[in-house]
Amino acid sequence: QGWQAFKNDATEIIPELGEYPEPPPELENNKTMNRAENGGRPPHHPFETKDVSEYSCRELHFTRYVTDGQCRSAKPVTELVCSGQCGPARLLPNAIGRGKWWRPSGPDFRCIPDRYRAQRVQLLCPGGAAPRARKVRLVASCKCKRLTRFHNQSELKDFGPEAARPQKGRKPRPRARGAKANQAELENAY
């Protein structure tokens, strides 16, 4: 299947809370952060916006014609291409309880298609042949998804908030929960 593509624009996807640390709303709105609410995090920590652009999952909008052999769609379709990386953010308070962010290495994420949509297109063929209808599957949205433990190279697992697990021999404190990767999240493959 051939494509004639024209890049239009891009939309940045900020991963959902629990998927990867990103700037909390308080920082974006320049509100003062409360030490108790943030697990003892100091209030002076600014979020460096270069980390967002450097590691964001972007939806690139492409307008293109669907082709099938000599036939081409009467109108172009708009599809998303997932681009960018879901990578490290500065150590931020909203990461508390959602992952052991202080570790030097952690869950690997990929920016990949999240939802698809089916669209019916009409293909026009040369030589006066009758138009043909065809259904195509187009990417509707992108998402950061976690690489999982067993690999058949086919699928990525959604990664929600991790199950809290107190440090061995320690009483759990609600403001700073340790979170080990939930084994249930590790059953599908990348």
Partner: antibody, heavy 119, light 110 residues
Framework: EVQLVESGGGLVQPGRSLRLSCAAS????????LHWVRQAPGKGLEWVSG????????DYADSVKGRFTISRDNAKNSLYLQMNSLRVEDTALYYC????????????WGQGTTVTVSS | QSVLTQPPSASGTPGQRVTISCSGS????????VNWYQQLPGTAPKLLIY???QRPSGVPDRFSGSKSGTSASLAISGLQSEDEADYYC???????????FGGGTKLTVL
């Protein structure tokens, strides 16, 4: 200039204790997670322990669990490693290292302090 | 025996491209980000690559990292004499609940 300076190393007998310190300067100490990494003579790197901004955020390597304790004092810009029940195999150059990007590697390192465990 | 496996040595001539491999398992490289460190003789390690393929500021773009499945690799293009060092890969291991390093690769520039 970002700097980590380790101290407290020395010669100690097996079974004894030692406390390592790491003094930080040139950056906002509380913004960093801190770690101890060691390197035995002529060998590779071995991660020992790590701590977030308080002591609910701690990890240890199996080889030191129950013997070593990591802690930090944000008021003093210092990281510590209390090493008890020392073994000959704990002999190494101990580095203090830090990261301030979640899951982003150890981007600040000290020059290390030598611990020798021998009878 | 290291959890992550690296070749003990690698070599190349100035200007050449060399690649250092790092092999792991599903519990480390397979599911977590990979970091690479450079240790010049007699000095402390330095972060070279984080998050599989990201370079900290100050690291030349001659260094690049990649990851596929349970393996990772570090590529150095336009090899220079000052690249002669030990290189270590590292990743978190979910089974060991520990940050694990490869055994290190000694790179010699001929």
């Amino acid at each position: 200039e970002v700097q980590l300076v380790e101290s407290g190393g020395g010669l100690v007998q097996p079974g004894r204790s030692l406390r390592l310190s790491c003094a930080a300067s040139g950056f906002t100490f509380e913004d960093y997670a801190l770690h101890w990494v060691r390197q035995a003579p002529g060998k590779g790197l071995e991660w020992v322990s790590g701590i977030g901004w308080d002591d609910d955020m701690i990890d240890y390597a199996d080889s030191v669990k129950g013997r070593f304790t990591i802690s930090r004092d944000n008021a003093k810009n210092s990281l510590y490693l209390q090493m008890n029940s020392l073994r000959v195999e704990d002999t190494a150059l101990y580095y203090c290292a830090g990261n301030n990007r979640g899951y982003g590697g150890l981007d600040v390192w000290g020059q290390g302090t030598t611990v020798t465990v021998s009878s | 025996q290291s959890v992550l496996t690296q070749p003990p040595s690698a070599s190349g001539t100035p200007g050449q491209r060399v690649t250092i491999s790092c092999s792991g398992s599903s519990s480390n490289i397979g599911s977590n980000t990979v970091n690479w460190y450079q240790q010049l003789p007699g000095t402390a390690p330095k972060l070279l690559i984080y998050n599989n393929n990201q370079r900290p500021s100050g690291v030349p773009d001659r260094f690049s990292g990649s990851k596929s499945g349970t393996s990772a690799s570090l590529a150095i293009s336009g090899l220079q004499s000052e690249d002669e060092a030990d290189y270590y890969c590292a990743a978190w291991d979910d089974s060991l609940d520990s940050y694990v390093f490869g055994g290190g690769t000694k790179l010699t520039v001929l």
